[in-house]
């Protein structure tokens, strides 16, 4: 697994560097997660032909993965910092069950999958510190998550491969959109 943010050799070699600001720390954390996702996608794509599947076929899958929309206030047009931050945190919390599902889906990248999951938890904590309106953040229901996890794990092999691919792709897109939005804050 890659070295977590703040522990790379450059940081060790530069003790006199300015401490990271909150936004730089968040940026670094997201990029670390994105690197992890890239590695996981590489294994998924090497293992199956899901990555070549057409977008239309993928869209038919009924996974309810978090997605950014104009109303969430994260785009340049109609940007709203607080609404957007709530959307990002809520979306990440919703992704957690899917990241749990990924834990037993990788052979050579098992550590990487765990690193993505744990780093996402840390990212949520960073963002919660930044949010003013924590009451607006809805936490997913644990019972609903448990039954969703059971349902996903009961799928046949092809559907499990498809689900893995979709989760990784959607999570990557959500994080990249979050990065774009957070840079405006």
């Amino acid at each position: 697994a890659p070295v977590p943010p703040g522990e790379d050799s450059k940081d060790v070699a530069a003790p006199h560097r300015q401490p990271l600001t909150s936004s730089e720390r968040i940026d670094k954390q997201i990029r670390y997660i994105l690197d992890g996702i890239s590695a996981l996608r590489k294994e998924t794509c090497n293992k199956s032909n899901m990555c070549e599947s057409s977008k239309e076929a993928l869209a038919e899958n009924n996974l309810n993965l978090p997605k950014m929309a104009e109303k969430d206030g994260c785009f340049q047009s109609g940007f709203n910092e607080e609404t957007c931050l709530v959307k990002i945190i809520t979306g990440l919390l919703e992704f957690e069950v899917y990241l749990e599902y990924l834990q037993n889906r990788f052979e050579s990248s098992e550590e990487q999958a765990r690193a993505v999951q744990m780093s996402t938890k840390v990212l949520i904590q960073f963002l919660q510190k930044k949010a003013k309106n924590l009451d607006a953040i809805t936490t997913p229901d644990p019972t609903t998550n448990a039954s969703l996890l059971t349902k996903l794990q009961a799928q046949n092999q092809w559907l499990q491969d498809m689900t893995t691919h979709l989760i990784l792709r959607s999570f990557k897109e959500f994080l990249q959109s979050s990065l774009r939005a957070l840079r405006q804050m």
Partner: antibody
């Protein structure tokens, strides 16, 4: 062959409109960041706008905000730049380019550019 | 928009010289910076991205460094093909460029 081809440039009067097209081949715009950059004669590069494939989210430079609109047609694998209320200072070669799907992104592919001249 | 200030605007140097171009951002941009080379009548081409990562196929005499607001592009030993205009570009918010540095033969 992987390439970008711009079209739609030309001479237009101040206050007029023009729509630039950028046809992509060899890759799909539906899964790539796209960007417009311009360069006035003898001047430097200026970022105009970009479009993130996810949900079609667009960003604009302050100098064009409210006048230019970037859009895409996935079925035609083409991105557009609709330019309204054109001014003399919009005269430039307009390049369509692709942000590499990296974090952070950078431009890994450029078109050859199309010249827009705003003059009466 | 984030302002990118490049210096110098023009740089006269000779083949074999070591040259450095500086780029300063009006706010912190982490390592969200790329360097491009442009020759007259041509589209630019990327040299360095992520502040210090060399693009595939670009000679190793080119190097980039910096983070936050201060960045540099260094050419360790100028070659005849290197006389061109160089631009930095941030991708932290939007994609503004520096005003360019024209590298000319002394």
């Amino acid at each position: 062959e992987v390439q970008l081809v711009e079209s739609g440039g030309g001479l237009v009067q101040p206050g007029g409109s023009l729509r630039l097209s950028c046809a992509a081949s060899g890759f799909t715009i539906s899964s790539n960041y796209m960007i417009w950059v311009r360069q006035a004669p003898g001047k430097g590069l200026e970022w105009v706008s970009d479009l993130y494939y996810y949900a079609g989210d667009t960003y604009y430079a302050d100098s064009v905000k409210g006048r230019f609109t970037m859009s895409r047609d996935i079925s035609k694998n083409t991105v557009y730049l609709q330019m309204n209320s054109l001014r003399a200072e919009d005269t430039a070669v307009y390049y369509c380019a692709r942000w590499a799907d990296d974090h952070p992104p950078y431009i890994d592919m450029w078109g050859r550019g199309t010249l827009v001249t705003v003059s009466s | 928009d984030i302002q990118m200030t490049q210096s110098p605007s023009t740089l006269s140097a000779s083949v074999g010289d070591r040259v450095t171009i500086t780029c300063r951002a009006s706010q912190g941009i982490s390592s969200w910076l790329a360097w491009y080379q442009q020759k007259p009548g041509k589209a630019p081409k990327v040299l360095i991205y992520k502040a210090s990562t060399l693009e595939s196929g670009v000679p190793s005499r080119f190097s980039g460094s910096g983070s936050g607001t201060e960045f540099t592009l260094t050419i360790s030993s100028l070659q005849p093909d290197d006389f061109a205009t160089y631009y930095c570009q941030q991708s932290w918010l939007g994609g503004s460029f520096g005003q360019g540095t024209k590298l000319e033969i002394k």
